[in-house]
C-alpha cells in the first residue's frame, strides 16, 4: 500500500502544530519530567510485517487523538491549534485505515498484532495516569506534549522506513 504524498506532509504539519502547542518554558518543568517508557521495540526494525507496522502506527495516532480530544486538553491547550491537529490526525487515520484494509485484508485479524497494540495502549495509559496524578497542571501538559512530539517523530521514522522498503 502506498501512503499518499499528502500523508508525509500531514505528519510534518502535525509535528509543527505540536511544537506550537507549547505554552510554558520546559526549563521551569524539570521537576515534573517523566519517563513514560515508550515501547521502542515496537518501532524498531525487527522482522516487522508491513501490516503489523501499519496497525501499530494506526493505534499510536488513534491514542494520540484520544489523548488530545479530552476536555482537559481543550482547557490546557490552544483550541485553534487543537482543531487543526485533529484534522491532521483524522486524515492520517483515514490513510492508514485504507492501508490496513489493503495489507491485512479481511481475512487476517488485527488481533495477530495484539501484543504490539497492547504495548502502545499501555504507554498511553501511563501518560493519562501521569496527567491525572499531576492534576493536569500546565507543566504536566508540557511534559506530555514533549513526549508525544518524540513518539510522533519515531512514528514518522517508522513510516519512512516502510516507504523505503517498498
Amino acid at each position: 500500500c502506498d501512503l499518499p504524498q499528502t500523508h508525509s506532509l500531514g505528519n510534518r504539519r502535525a509535528l509543527i502544530l505540536l511544537a506550537q502547542m507549547r505554552r510554558i518554558s520546559p526549563f521551569s518543568c524539570l521537576k515534573d519530567r517523566h519517563d513514560f517508557e515508550f515501547p521502542q521495540e515496537e518501532f524498531d526494525d525487527k522482522q516487522f510485517q508491513k501490516a503489523q507496522a501499519i496497525s501499530v502506527l494506526h493505534e499510536m495516532i488513534q491514542q494520540t487523538f484520544n489523548l488530545f480530544s479530552t476536555k482537559d486538553s481543550s482547557a490546557a491547550l490552544d483550541e485553534t491549534l487543537l482543531d487543526e491537529f485533529y484534522i491532521e490526525l483524522d486524515q492520517q487515520l483515514n490513510d492508514l485505515e485504507s492501508c490496513v484494509m489493503q495489507e491485512v485484508g479481511v481475512i487476517e485479524s488485527p488481533l495477530m498484532y495484539e501484543d504490539s497494540i497492547l504495548a502502545v495502549r499501555k504507554y498511553f495509559q501511563r501518560i493519562t495516569l501521569y496527567l491525572t496524578e499531576k492534576k493536569y497542571s500546565s507543566c504536566a501538559w508540557e511534559v506530555v506534549r514533549a513526549e508525544i512530539m518524540r513518539s510522533f517523530s519515531l512514528s514518522i521514522n517508522l513510516q519512512k522506513r516502510l516507504k523505503s522498503k517498498e
Partner: antibody, heavy 123, light 112 residues
C-alpha cells in the same frame, strides 16, 4: 551526516560585543533544542545558554545573564550567540551543541558539538 | 548550583587493561522519575567533546561497549574495560538534573 559549523570568534576589547554563529546541516534543525558551551583556558567546560527548538524559550546561568543572548533562525538553520559587555573571564573556546530528543524525560544530553570558535577578551 | 567534582588525572593505565574515572556531585542526581541525570563526555586532544554516556548508564550511539558507567546518585564511575590508545583525552562528567547544567573539571586519562 550531522554537522555544526561555527564562526564569529575574534579578539575583542573588554566591554565590547561579538556575535557567534552556528550553521546546522544533516538534521531537522527546527526539531532540536540547542546550547552554547564554552571551554575556558584552564580546559573547564562551562554551560552558557540553551534555547528550545522553536526559539520561544531560553535560559542563562547568572554568569552571563543580561549580557549574552541566544537566538536561532530556523529558516536559515542557524544558531546565534550575541555577547555584549564582554569581560576577560569570557575568554574561551565557544561550542554550539545539539540536544538529543528527550521526550517527556527532558534529556538534555548534547549529542553533537560544533568544532568551536575562539573568543579572546583582552585590551 | 550543583557542583561536579573530578580528579585532574586518572591513575596511569597500561593499554589493554581497565581504567576507572570517578565523579562526585554535591547533590543526588536521581530524579523522582527514576532517571539519574548524569552524563559523561570525552574530549580527545584537538577535538570537540563527544557524548559517551547519558542518564548515568546508557551508551551513546557509536560508543564501543568497552565503556560502562554506574553510580549511586552522588558517586559515579566510568569504566573502560580494555583501554586503547584512542581513548586518551579528558573525561568530563555533567549533570542535567537542574539548571544551570554543570560539568566536572575533567579527568585526563594517563597511559603508562
Amino acid at each position: 551526516e550531522v554537522q555544526l559549523q561555527q564562526s564569529g570568534g575574534d579578539l575583542v576589547k573588554p566591554g565590547g560585543s561579538l556575535k557567534l554563529s552556528c550553521a546546522a546541516s544533516g538534521f531537522t534543525f527546527s526539531s532540536y533544542g540547542m546550547s552554547w558551551v564554552r571551554q575556558t583556558p584552564d580546559k573547564r567546560l562551562d554551560w552558557v545558554s540553551i534555547i528550545t527548538s522553536g526559539g520561544s524559550y531560553t535560559y542563562y546561568p547568572d554568569s552571563v545573564k543580561g549580557r549574552f543572548t541566544i537566538s536561532r533562525d530556523n529558516a536559515k538553520n542557524t544558531l546565534y550567540l550575541q555577547m555584549s559587555s564582554l569581560k576577560s573571564e569570557d575568554t574561551a573556546m565557544y561550542y554550539c551543541a545539539r540536544h538529543a530528543e528527550g521526550g517527556g524525560n527532558y534529556d538534555y544530553a548534547m549529542d553533537y558539538w560544533g568544532q568551536g570558535t575562539s573568543v579572546t577578551v583582552s585590551s | 548550583d550543583i557542583v561536579m567534582t573530578q580528579a585532574a588525572f586518572s591513575n596511569p593505565v597500561t593499554l589493554g587493561t581497565s581504567a576507572s574515572i570517578s565523579c562526585r556531585s554535591s547533590k543526588s542526581l536521581l530524579h523522582s522519575n527514576g532517571i539519574t541525570y548524569l552524563y559523561w563526555y570525552l574530549q580527545k586532544p584537538g577535538q570537540s567533546p563527544q557524548l559517551l554516556i547519558y542518564q548515568m548508564s546508557n551508551l551513546a550511539s557509536g560508543v564501543p561497549d568497552r565503556f560502562s558507567s554506574s553510580g549511586s546518585g552522588i558517586d559515579f564511575t566510568l569504566r573502560i574495560s580494555r583501554v586503547e590508545a584512542e581513548d586518551v583525552g579528558a573525561y568530563y562528567c555533567a549533570q542535567n538534573l537542574e539548571l544551570p547544567f554543570t560539568f566536572g573539571s575533567g579527568t585526563k586519562l594517563e597511559i603508562k
